[in-house]
């Protein structure tokens, strides 16, 4: 679809007369019909194939004509057309005199005809203006004409339909050969395709609109290159999505269990040194001076009841001193003034004499000690329990209460739960918390691996986007082969498309 | 266990502008990447802003871009959501969650309720 | 953006019975679908994850279901404590978006 356009430039008629050689009276008021036709080698009449036009009267005699393309486009005159240009044309221009108001051919006498030109040729696409010429003996005319295309039509022959647009269904604007011109961050055949940020990872990002990445799940940053860890996980990354890689310290399979519990939380007090006997458990070495699970009781240096034979402690700045009963002495009251004579056993204690009579000894009953039998035995003295167990005394003996998770006589032992072998056909036992966990081989199921299952690997249907799942008997795994469009080992992520 | 725990109720006049908090704990909050989900008034649930874990680049939804600034702050477990121009419409309860704009959001706070009334 | 569609808007069972919620996404999201519950004056809680994966301590009585477009959520046996407002999401395309809920309520 194009238009020819014919500029009218000058026409001259100094004598003022018709073809027939008549003067016009009172003189010639001259208008001009067109035909637009295909080539003929000889141009002859018939129909006007590719359009007529006419004008008003233009002017009397000789006369310049004007550009005037705001009453209704009369100069340059528009031959519009819907088809294909072929490239060569006919040309016919008749002026005729117009005696009355009327131009209609029929409306004309025959001899009011002033003059006609023909010409033929070829006349490619383009702005440019070809200027002609034609004289005859009494007139002449000069005219210049072109063919352009219409708007959105382009091409050697304007028939490439190229509408410039922007939006959902292209971003472009047209070059003259009516090829798509894509605008700044678009691409692709229709020029709807954003052109992502760039360096956006080219599986894992894509975008819908230019300079933007933006992730497929399991994917985050700004280029899309950092995975996202699992839901569950709490102390670990990932190299690929949805794995929970644990940090230092941690340990279990989201990376819950703390291994390194006198890092993380330094129950440890007054200077203990804090050591990791398993997960979420630890031992503290008390400095002198300190005792308790996590060495936060400071030790009397009178707790150790250092004073013999009934003394009494006094705790002091520099350590502690003995008050000694009658009929002792010494720093722990340790030397004795008194022989049997004195009974000084107590508590039903029997007393030997020992070096003539210059001292004596004193034997116990049970449950009590001293070098008087005036203390009573307390076995928990020496805080025989371990990993936190509380001592109770019970008469002559003594037991350890132990926390959950230890057992033994001094709660020395560890419980694990994995220790009676509790996951069937060949699982393995995690030590959780407060529980234990199994993970099953190929083949079996359930809390305690005890339920058989197909081994088919493909059973779970384990690929996405209608994949066909294979399974490998010899290693009881499965392949998925993609279909197009799609890539990841369970085809997972769609290609290219957004 | 997995806590995030978010700063009190706010009442604001329009115009005014609000920082919100959310920390956390029982995770490695370094690793992982955060965001803000609003609830207005009896609605339903409407995702507002994330930011990743690695680099720190932060996503919005077109109809909040340029209100709001998501951020964090890894040496201290917290997430934040800033306003400098606060308008009635974003009147809402705001909470924090664990997770990108193409993943679950695994882990919640409790909730701020952002109030912005003449 | 992708419009999530739940129906039915409010669904009443009683205790003991079974419940099954309705996910309709506007176009394909693969599996990435989740599911949330939420009791009045709490904050939502992940009950499902891609689809059919159970979130942490949430028990074996949720299930999830589908693919592409349409997705359910089924609890076999309602407990009290399962009366709540339920909502899917989807987390394939950006921006994600939630469905509108669906209010699961005591018949």
């Known amino acids: 679809s194009g238009v020819f356009q014919l500029q009218l430039q000058e026409f001259i008629n100094e004598r003022g007369v018709l073809a027939s050689g008549r003067p016009c009276e009172p003189g010639c008021r001259t208008f001009f019909r067109v035909c637009l036709k295909h080539f003929q080698a000889v141009v002859s009449p018939g129909p006007c194939t590719f359009g007529t036009v006419s004008t008003p009267v233009l002017g009397t005699n000789s006369f310049a004509v004007r550009d005037d393309s705001s009453g209704g486009g009369r100069n340059p005159l528009q031959l519009p057309f819907n088809f294909t240009w072929p490239g060569t044309f006919s040309l016919i221009i008749e002026a005729w005199h117009a005696p009355g108001d009327d131009l209609r051919p029929e409306a004309l006498p025959p001899d009011a005809l002033i003059s006609k030109i023909a010409i033929q040729g070829s006349l490619a696409v383009g702005q440019n203006w070809l200027l002609d010429e034609q004289t005859s003996t009494l007139t002449r005319l000069r005219y210049s004409y072109r063919v352009i295309c219409s708007d959105n039509y382009y091409g050697d022959n304007c028939s490439r339909l190229c509408k410039k647009r922007n939006d959902h269904f292209g971003h472009y604007v047209c070059q003259p050969d009516g090829n798509l011109s894509c605008l700044p961050g678009w691409t692709g055949e229709y020029c709807q395709q954003p052109i992502c940020l760039s360096g956006c990872h080219e599986q894992n990002g894509y975008c819908s609109k230019p300079a933007e990445c933006l992730c497929r799940p399991g994917w985050q940053g700004r280029l899309c290159n950092e995975c996202i860890p699992h839901n569950g996980c709490r102390h670990g990354t990932c190299s690929t999505p949805w794995q929970c890689t644990c940090d230092e310290g941690w340990g279990g399979l989201f990376c819950d269990q703390d291994l390194n519990y006198c890092t993380h939380h330094s129950p440890c007090k007054n200077g203990a040194t804090c050591s990791n006997s398993g997960q979420r458990s630890y031992t503290c070495t008390c400095r002198p001076g300190y005792t308790g699970v996590d060495c936060e009781l400071e030790l009397s240096e009178c707790d150790s009841n250092p004073c013999r034979n009934g003394g009494s402690c006094k705790d002091q700045e520099d350590g502690y001193h003995c008050l000694c009963p009658p009929g002792y002495y010494g720093l722990h009251c340790e030397h004795s003034t008194l022989s049997c004579a004195d009974s000084p056993c107590f508590n039903g204690g029997s007393c030997r004499e020992r070096n003539q009579g210059a001292n004596y000894a004193c034997e116990c009953p049970p449950n009590f000690t001293g070098s008087n039998c005036e203390k009573k035995v307390d076995r928990c003295t020496s805080n025989p329990c371990a990993n936190g167990g509380q001592c109770l005394n019970r008469g002559p003996s003594r037991m350890c209460r132990c926390r959950p998770g230890f057992t033994g006589t001094y709660c020395e032992l560890h419980v694990s739960d994995c220790a009676r072998n509790p996951c069937a056909h060949g699982g393995t036992c995690h030590d959780l918390e407060n529980g234990l966990m199994c993970t099953c081989p190929a083949g079996f199921s359930g809390r305690r691996c005890e339920v058989r299952t197909s081994i088919d690997a493909c059973a779970s249907s384990p690929c996405f986007n209608r994949a066909t799942c294979y399974t490998d008997l010899s290693t009881d795994t499965f392949v998925c082969n993609c279909p197009y469009g799609f890539v990841g080992s369970r085809c997972e992520f769609p290609v290219g498309l957004p | 266990e997995v806590q995030l725990v978010q700063s009190g109720t706010e009442v604001k006049k329009p115009g005014e502008s609000l920082k919100i908090s959310c920390k956390a704990s029982?995770?490695?909050?370094?690793?992982?990447?955060m965001a803000w989900v609003r609830q207005m008034p009896g609605k339903g649930l409407e995702w507002v802003a994330t930011?990743?874990?690695?680099?720190?680049?932060?996503y919005y939804r077109d109809s909040v871009k340029g209100q709001f600034t998501i951020s964090r702050d890894n040496s201290f477990n917290t997430l934040f959501l800033q306003w400098s121009s606060l308008k009635a419409s974003d009147t809402a309860m705001y909470y924090c969650a664990r997770g990108y704009y193409n993943s679950p959001f695994a882990y919640w706070g409790q909730g701020t309720m952002v109030t912005v009334s003449s | 953006e992708i419009v999530m569609t739940q129906s039915p808007a409010t669904l009443s069972v009683s205790p003991g019975e079974r419940a099954t919620l309705s996910c309709r996404a506007s176009?394909?999201?693969?599996?990435?679908l989740a599911w949330y519950q939420q009791k009045p004056g709490q904050a939502p809680r992940l009950l499902i994850y891609d689809t059919n994966n159970l979130a942490d301590d949430v028990p074996a009585r949720f299930s999830g279901s589908g693919s592409g477009t349409e997705f359910t959520l089924t609890i076999s046996s309602l407990q009290s404590e399962d009366f709540a407002v339920y909502y899917c999401?989807?987390?394939?395309?950006?921006?994600?978006?939630f469905g509108q809920g669906t209010r699961l309520e005591i018949k």
């Open positions: 999401q989807q987390y394939n395309n950006y921006p994600p978006t």
């Open positions: 029982g995770f490695t909050f370094s690793n992982f990447p």
């Open positions: 930011i990743s874990s690695s680099d720190g680049t932060t």
């Open positions: 176009e394909d999201i693969y599996s990435n």
